[in-house]
Amino acid sequence: AILGRSETQECLFFNANWEKDRTNQTGVEPCYGDKDKRRHCFATWKNISGSIEIVKQGCWLDDINCYDRTDCVEKKDSPEVYFCCCEGNMCNEKFSYFPEMEVTQPTSNPVTPKP
């Protein structure tokens, strides 16, 4: 059963390592894949002494852990590299960090990337 699913056809693209990888630095990435597979957007970033450094943004292959996520939110507590994925066109344009502990209330740190 799938309820109210949003298709992902394109995602915001960013690659901090664009020169080495020989890609564009930023843009819009069309998401390709098998017809029977879902597609997602992702963002990955680091927090260096309070400063957000985006590592990559783009399309993400069919992954059940990304299903039904309309917003790109990292919930893991203090990860080394932050990661989130979501469904819906350009849903990785904004990403945020809501560390969810089992007992404490989450705190919100929304981020609007400015590569």
Partner: antibody
Framework: EVQLLESGGGLVQPGGSLRLSCAAS????????MSWVRQAPGKGLEWVSA????????YYTDSVKGRFTVSRDNSRNTLYLQMNSLRAEDTAVYYC???????????WGQGTLVTVSS | QTVVTQEPSFSVSPGGTVTLTCGFN?????????PSWYQQTPGQAPRTLIY???TRSSGVPDRFSGSILGNKAALTITGAQADDESDYYC??????????FGGGTKLTVLG
């Protein structure tokens, strides 16, 4: 420490019903997709069902479609498997497993035995 | 119906190297199927070894490695030890929520 504790297994007659539960702790349950995997005596592992983080998407192996229902209660950190119209071939140890990015099973419970026999 | 195939059994000498493979009936295995590998000893829950083709799970010794060999996923164990004697399962993620297990390989460490 991540813990997954299954319960609800037991002996049931063919055609009967059982509800399995999996109590999760040590991680943010509402942020993880979950799965049920089973293993018949002396046989290999078989994926049974999966459910997305919100419970909005559910998936089943063909042999249990229409008979089994997976659900989750994120406020109780608990995963469920409602099994109806049970058959002898459903006899197995049922494991619940946490699913992480790249759609793999990163943590497993110890399993609960379901025996379908008259 | 997708069928994932593994060698039913395999033997290796202590200290030797063994490569177990995982294929399927409807084409080539690629990284987009997120191949993962699990070890199971009798009476125990499975243990995660490798995910996303070649990433070792935490605490897994570097004797275990994953790859794509030709059109199959592969698990290689180098310097095999007696306690590597177990059943090994691969899983392919077919997309749209569906996972498929291979039939498993029973690995015997000789001696």
């Amino acid at each position: 420490e991540v813990q997954l504790l299954e319960s609800g297994g037991g002996l049931v007659q063919p055609g009967g019903s059982l509800r399995l539960s999996c109590a999760a702790s040590g991680f943010t349950f509402r942020n993880s997709a979950m799965s049920w995997v089973r293993q018949a005596p002396g046989k290999g592992l078989e994926w049974v069902s999966a459910i997305s983080v919100t419970g909005g998407s559910t998936y089943y192996t063909d042999s249990v479609k229409g008979r089994f229902t997976v659900s989750r209660d994120n406020s109780r950190n608990t995963l469920y498997l409602q099994m109806n119209s049970l058959r002898a071939e459903d006899t197995a140890v049922y494991y619940c497993a946490k699913v992480y990015y790249y759609s793999f099973f990163d943590y497993w419970g110890q399993g609960t035995l379901v025996t379908v026999s008259s | 119906q997708t069928v994932v195939t593994q060698e039913p059994s395999f033997s290796v000498s202590p200290g030797g190297t063994v490569t177990l493979t995982c294929g399927f009936n409807s084409g080539s295995v690629s990284t987009s199927y997120y191949p993962s590998w699990y070890q199971q000893t009798p009476g125990q829950a499975p243990r995660t070894l490798i995910y996303n083709t070649n990433t070792r799970s935490s605490g897994v010794p570097d004797r275990f490695s994953g790859s794509i060999l030709g059109n199959k996923a592969a698990l290689t164990i180098t310097g095999a030890q007696a306690d590597d004697e177990s059943d090994y399962y691969c899983v392919l993620y077919m997309g749209s929520g569906i996972h498929v297990f291979g039939g498993g390989t029973k690995l015997t460490v000789l001696g």
